[in-house]
Each structure stands twice: as structure tokens, then as C-alpha cells.
Interface confidence: low
């Protein structure tokens, strides 16, 4: 196999190094020469030539292959020219020769993938591998080959992508920072509780790869799909040179689905306890799990320990399947929260669904605000409400909705961020219902909408804006 990888090497005397502390050289002879005909000599500059012990093997329909494995690690030196020549002892001639740098003939042994698992985000895959020669791993680059595992279609699309080495820890990037606040004050950022659009299948170039030592994160994959993958390595071409080694043995992995599909929503009311809820599936049981990760820690291999999210009592006793499953757990404000939901169907098949990671301060749900109103003059209404949380008044935004009695459609107004009230110009002698809800959407705190306040009935209606 190594020979085929060196096919592009036009030198008759072919050499390769697995770890840059070893060297193997070989060449082929058509004639069947007597044993001991050839001697492989080598020398570094200003040093005496030495002989490398040769072994030979018969090549069917061709001749003999002579192989030398350098006997001593100290004889394998980087960054210095190594002169090699094959001498015919009997004929006193040099059969072939070459000058090489050991550091330019690398042919690394394939890394062995020791773990492939879902990453911290839906559609991510975390791979960890062991380098056969860890001391040179900093001087290698890696290539990943992967594709969807489809038993019906063994020739599915294959992606081959170079792994880009990063200094950061890709699997633990800050999740969804709320930087989209320059839109309307209540613009909905992409948060873990949002039922956003499902990820589409990536194009061949769409998936992104990052590496951290012996681990790599692939993103942009299809959540819920199965993939096969292989790794190989090559010297980086800067510090060390050589060729791509062979591919590792393939491994397969099932990616968890995206919990958006279950309508997963997590929130906290007190910045201590987190409640998660998701749609209950028919004829299936489900269980929530969580774990905390530190934003700045960057372990070489990440094997999170998922903890049980404590199930809440069903709110509707009886035979009917509840609409939502809920669970809760104590959290910390210095860690990223990861959520996994396992759904077990009647035959016992388990499907995993991964939520997008979040910080607890990104999931603060406010209590329902109270709406008060009074009519100042005919058709002129003054509204007032208390901030549900005075400690985050400047980060609280509101939505007011109203509808005429007998109408189905609601008009929605968005007061300015942090407003405590407002006025409405009203059309006299009409009946309307008003409701208010609040959410945090500031630089410090964010979260989902509170529930709408109980409908407030007024005798007039507005069509004017704020």
C-alpha cells in the first residue's frame, strides 16, 4: 500500500518516513542477483558512509524488491541532506543514488479515530483521533473524507475536506451572542427557544471544519442523519514535507436530530432553575438531559456527561397524551447549557435531539406584565404597566396587541425599549381587547416572550401607532 502512495515519486530509490524518526527505503531490480550483490550506503555531510541492512522479497512477474529500514533512530536526522546510493558489490558500480532530506519524505500512518459523536450544536460532529506519532502531530495536516451513510445507496455523495487548524476551541464557541439588537427592539434573534427554519442539507462545500490538536469539529451536516468518515494525514509542507498517508478505517456515527423539530424551549424565571419543554410525541416517551460546559476550557477530547433533567409532573392526569413534556434542573451562570432530548418510540428505538447551547442569561423568561389604562379624554387612552423585573428595565421590550370585539385578527404594537407606558388615540364608542407581553432583549439578558396578560377590555379602540 505504501508503494502505491509513492507512485508519483519518480526516483528509482524510494524512501519514506512514518514518524520522522524512522526511514524506510526500497528499490526494485528486474534481475535476480545473487544474495549480497547490493549494498545500500548512506552518509550525512562530512560523515563516513554506513551500510543499511537489506532485506529482499520476490516480486511476482517482475524481480526482487530490496528494502532497508534504518536500524537506529539516531541515524535519522531532520534538516540535513542524506546521500543514499546503491552499490553493486560485485561489479563495483553505483546502481542508483539520491540525496534527500528525511523531513521531506513523510508518509504518515493513518490516525485512528477513537471517537465520533454529535457536537454541541445540531448538525455538528465532533471527531477525536489518536496520532500514531503524537510528537509530530503539530507538523501534520489532516484531511477528512465523509458522506451520508445510506444502506440503499453505497455511492452517496462524498466530501473530502482539509481540516483547518485553529487556535481556538471550536466546539466551545460562545453560543448565539445577542448582537442583533440594532434591529427593532423586539426583533427575534435566533435563540435556542425559537422555532426557526430547519437546516437544509449542506452542499459539498458548505460544511465547515475546524481542528484542535487531535480533535475536529464539522458543522453544517444534516441533523438526524448517519455519516461515515475517514481521516488521513500529510506533513504540512512547511516544517515537514511528504505525501498523504493512507486513509484510516471508516467509522460511522448517527447525528442527533435538531430539537427545533420538537419545539424545544428552555427558560429560567430566577436565573437559578431552568425549565425546558418540548412537544410530546404520540406513542413515545421522552427524557431530557443537560450538561454544562465552560466557555474557555478546551479539552483535547470532549466527552460530556449528560445529567438527567428532572421530569415535572404531568399537568393533565388521565389517558390523554399531554401536549408538552417539561423538565427542570439547577443551572449556573458561568457555563454554557446544553440540552438533549431522547425520544423512545414504542418498538424501543431511541432518537436523540440536540438543542442549541445557551447561557442562562439568554433564557430569562419574565413574568406576565400587568396592563393598566385610563381614559384621559374622549378617544384618548393612557396605558401604563409595571416592569416585571425592575433590575432589567432598560433591557425589557414589550408587545401590545389589540383587537376589536368580534374580530379575529390582532394588531401588534411595539413600544420603545424600556418604555413604562404610552398613549393611544382611540375611536370612541368601540369595544376592544388589549393584551401585553414582555421579554428581555438587551446586552445582558435575553429570553423568550412571557405569556400574554389577561385580556383588558376597553370601551374604545385605536388604529393609531405609538
Amino acid at each position: 500500500q505504501d508503494v502505491s502512495l509513492l507512485a508519483s515519486d519518480s526516483e528509482p530509490l524510494k524512501c519514506f518516513s512514518r514518524t520522522f524518526e524512522d526511514l524506510t527505503c526500497f528499490w526494485d531490480e528486474e534481475e535476480a542477483a545473487p544474495s549480497g550483490t547490493y549494498q545500500l550506503l548512506y552518509a550525512y555531510p562530512r560523515e563516513k558512509p554506513r551500510a543499511c541492512p537489506l532485506s529482499s522479497q520476490s516480486m511476482p512477474h517482475f524481480g526482487t524488491r530490496y528494502v532497508c529500514q534504518f536500524p537506529d533512530q539516531e541515524e535519522v536526522r531532520l534538516f540535513f541532506p542524506l546521500h543514499l546510493w546503491v552499490k553493486n558489490v560485485f561489479l563495483n558500480q553505483t546502481r542508483t543514488q539520491r540525496v534527500l532530506f528525511v523531513d521531506s519524505v513523510g508518509l504518515p500512518a493513518p490516525p485512528s479515530i477513537i471517537k465520533a459523536m454529535g457536537g454541541s450544536q445540531p448538525g455538528e460532529l465532533q471527531i477525536s483521533w489518536e496520532e500514531p506519532a503524537p510528537e509530530i502531530s503539530d507538523f501534520l495536516r489532516y484531511e477528512l473524507r465523509y458522506g451520508p451513510r445510506d444502506p440503499k445507496n453505497s455511492t452517496g455523495p462524498t466530501v473530502i475536506q482539509l481540516i483547518a487548524t485553529e487556535t481556538c476551541c471550536p466546539a466551545l464557541q460562545r453560543p448565539h451572542s445577542a448582537s442583533a439588537l440594532d434591529q427593532s427592539p423586539c426583533a427575534q434573534p435566533t435563540m435556542p427557544w425559537q422555532d426557526g427554519p430547519k437546516q437544509t442539507s449542506p452542499s459539498r462545500e458548505a460544511s465547515a471544519l475546524t481542528a484542535e490538536g487531535g480533535s475536529c469539529l464539522i458543522s453544517g451536516l444534516q441533523p438526524g442523519n448517519s455519516y461515515w468518515l475517514q481521516l488521513r494525514s500529510e506533513p504540512d509542507g512547511i516544517s515537514l514535507g511528504g505525501s498523504w498517508g493512507s486513509w484510516s478505517l471508516p467509522v460511522t456515527v448517527d447525528l442527533p436530530g435538531d430539537a427545533v423539530a420538537l419545539g424545544l424551549q428552555c427558560f429560567t424565571l430566577d436565573l437559578k432553575n431552568v425549565t425546558c419543554q418540548w412537544q410530546q410525541q404520540d406513542h413515545a416517551s421522552s427524557q431530557g438531559f443537560f450538561y454544562h460546559s465552560r466557555a474557555r476550557c478546551c479539552p483535547r477530547d470532549r466527552y460530556p456527561i449528560w445529567e438527567n433533567c428532572e421530569e415535572e409532573e404531568k399537568t393533565n392526569p388521565g389517558l390523554q397524551t399531554p401536549q408538552f413534556s417539561r423538565c427542570h434542573f439547577k443551572s449556573r451562570n458561568d457555563s454554557i447549557i446544553h440540552i438533549l432530548v431522547e425520544v423512545t418510540t414504542a418498538p424501543g428505538t431511541v432518537h436523540s435531539y440536540l438543542g442549541s447551547p445557551f447561557w442562562i442569561h439568554q433564557a430569562v423568561r419574565l413574568p406576565t406584565p400587568n396592563l393598566h389604562w385610563r381614559e384621559i379624554s374622549s378617544g384618548h387612552l393612557e396605558l401604563e404597566w409595571q416592569h416585571p423585573s425592575s433590575w432589567a428595565a432598560q433591557e425589557t421590550c414589550y408587545q401590545l396587541r389589540y383587537t376589536g370585539e368580534g374580530h379575529q385578527d390582532w394588531k401588534v404594537l411595539e413600544p420603545p425599549l424600556g418604555a413604562r407606558g404610552g398613549t393611544l388615540e382611540l375611536r370612541p364608542r368601540s369595544r376592544y381587547r388589549l393584551q401585553l407581553r414582555a421579554r428581555l432583549n438587551g446586552p445582558t439578558y435575553q429570553g423568550p416572550w412571557s405569556s400574554w396578560s389577561d385580556p383588558t377590555r376597553v370601551e374604545t379602540a385605536t388604529e393609531t401607532a405609538w
Epitope: V99, F101, G237, I238, S239
Partner: antibody, heavy 118, light 107 residues
Framework: QVQLQESGPGLVKPSQTLSLTCTVS?????????WNWIRQPPGNGLEWIGY???????SYNPSLKSRVLISVDTSKNQVSLKLSSVTAADTAVYYC???????????WGQGTTVTVSS | DVVMTQSPSSLSASVGDRVTITCMAS??????LAWYQQKPGNAPKLLIY???SLETGVPSRFSGSGSGTDFTLTISSLQPEDFATYYC?????????FGGGTKVEIK
């Protein structure tokens, strides 16, 4: 920060031996790397003279090999160059430089001018 | 010895010009080629290593290309501080050898 500083007589008589030292600060010359001498005759290009490795192995330019000796004084962290039987053709700026991880001369001294004249 | 032939030996150019210097090796040297810049009275300064890799701190207007025997140094937009002499150097086989240099002068 690695720094290299060449020193030696600026004037050498023909047929005598030119002796230069390169004092390395910020790095132990026996720890790693290869230490080179390069020269540049007035108005001309660069010519590699030779090197000594951290372990004491030397390699010289064949064109100067018979006249060159590169050595180290580990106690002073210095690399020395001796060039015997000099002629006017050896008049040049002499540089010492470190051969770095990528085989390139990544740190250089500022150079010292040597004139061979009677 | 590997002979390095650099061309042109000198050139005149204006600020903002694109400048190309070539270096040819007498035998295959893989990508083990460096480019240096030298200003009068100073030691050479490493610009490019491994034929194409930019040394840390060197402006991105400098770029290198080539492998085997033919190599090129390009300055995409010449700046006043770029007027100097440029040398290529092979470090494939001992003795290390330099090109004859290219002097870039103000037109």
C-alpha cells in the same frame, strides 16, 4: 529575543588568518539550531561559508573548505570563524546568521567589515 | 553545487508598480527556496520561506511562487521602503547558494 553580534579586526594582512567571533545572546547555541557564516564582497552578492550545528557538526562551502574552520566557545556562547591564507578576494562584510526551523537564515548579525590589505 | 540564477540583475520601477523577480535553480530544489531583502548597510532580512510562505511581519504585498527549478518573487504595489536588493537562496542541498541579487531602484 535572539541577537547576534559579529566582532573582529577590521584589517587583516594577506596570507594571515582572519578570525571573527559571533556572540549570540538570548539563546544557547548548544541547545538547538545551526549557526552560519555568510560573506558579501563589496558590491557583490552573498556567499555561504559554512555552518556549525548545535551539536558541533560542521559543513563548509567546498570552495573555501581547505581554509575554513568554524568552532564554538560554549562558555561565551560564541561561534568563531577562522579563514586562513587570506587574499584581497576575501575582503567582505562577514555576517553570522542562525539557520532556523525552516532552513532559512531567520536571525542575522549586523555584519562586520574585513579588509585584507598590506 | 546548485547554481541559482536571478534575473534581472537590476530594474527601475515607480511607487505603485507591480514588480516581478525570477530565480532559476540548476536542479530541482523542491520548494526549499527563500527570498531576502537587503538595504544598503544592513543585513539581509527574510521575506519568504518555502518558496511561497510569508515570514511573520512581512507585508502581504510580497508573495512568492514556484517549485522545482523556477521561482518568482512579486511585489504587488511597490512602496518607497521596498527599494533594495533582493536575493533568492536555495537550502535544498549543501552548499547553500544564493542568487546574484536584483537591485530595485527608483525610476
Amino acid at each position: 529575543q535572539v541577537q547576534l553580534q559579529e566582532s573582529g579586526p577590521g584589517l587583516v594582512k594577506p596570507s594571515q588568518t582572519l578570525s571573527l567571533t559571533c556572540t549570540v545572546s538570548g539563546y544557547s547555541i548548544t541547545s538547538d539550531y545551526t549557526w552560519n557564516w555568510i560573506r558579501q564582497p563589496p558590491g557583490n552578492g552573498l556567499e555561504w561559508i559554512g555552518y556549525i550545528t548545535y551539536s558541533g557538526s560542521t559543513s563548509y562551502n567546498p570552495s573555501l573548505k581547505s581554509r575554513v574552520l568554524i568552532s564554538v566557545d560554549t562558555s561565551k556562547n560564541q561561534v568563531s570563524l577562522k579563514l586562513s591564507s587570506v587574499t584581497a578576494a576575501d575582503t567582505a562584510v562577514y555576517y553570522c546568521a542562525r539557520l532556523g526551523r525552516r532552513y532559512t537564515m531567520d536571525y542575522w548579525g549586523q555584519g562586520t567589515t574585513v579588509t585584507v590589505s598590506s | 553545487d546548485v547554481v541559482m540564477t536571478q534575473s534581472p540583475s537590476s530594474l527601475s520601477a515607480s511607487v505603485g508598480d507591480r514588480v516581478t523577480i525570477t530565480c532559476m535553480a540548476s536542479e530541482d530544489i523542491y520548494i526549499r527556496l527563500a527570498w531576502y531583502q537587503q538595504k544598503p548597510g544592513n543585513a539581509p532580512k527574510l521575506l519568504i520561506y518555502a518558496a511561497t510562505s510569508l515570514e511573520t511581519g512581512v507585508p502581504s504585498r510580497f508573495s512568492g511562487s514556484g517549485s522545482g527549478t523556477d521561482f518568482t518573487l512579486t511585489i504587488s504595489s511597490l512602496q518607497p521602503e521596498d527599494f533594495a536588493t533582493y536575493y533568492c537562496q536555495q537550502y535544498w542541498s549543501s552548499p547553500w547558494t544564493f542568487g546574484g541579487g536584483t537591485k530595485v531602484e527608483i525610476k
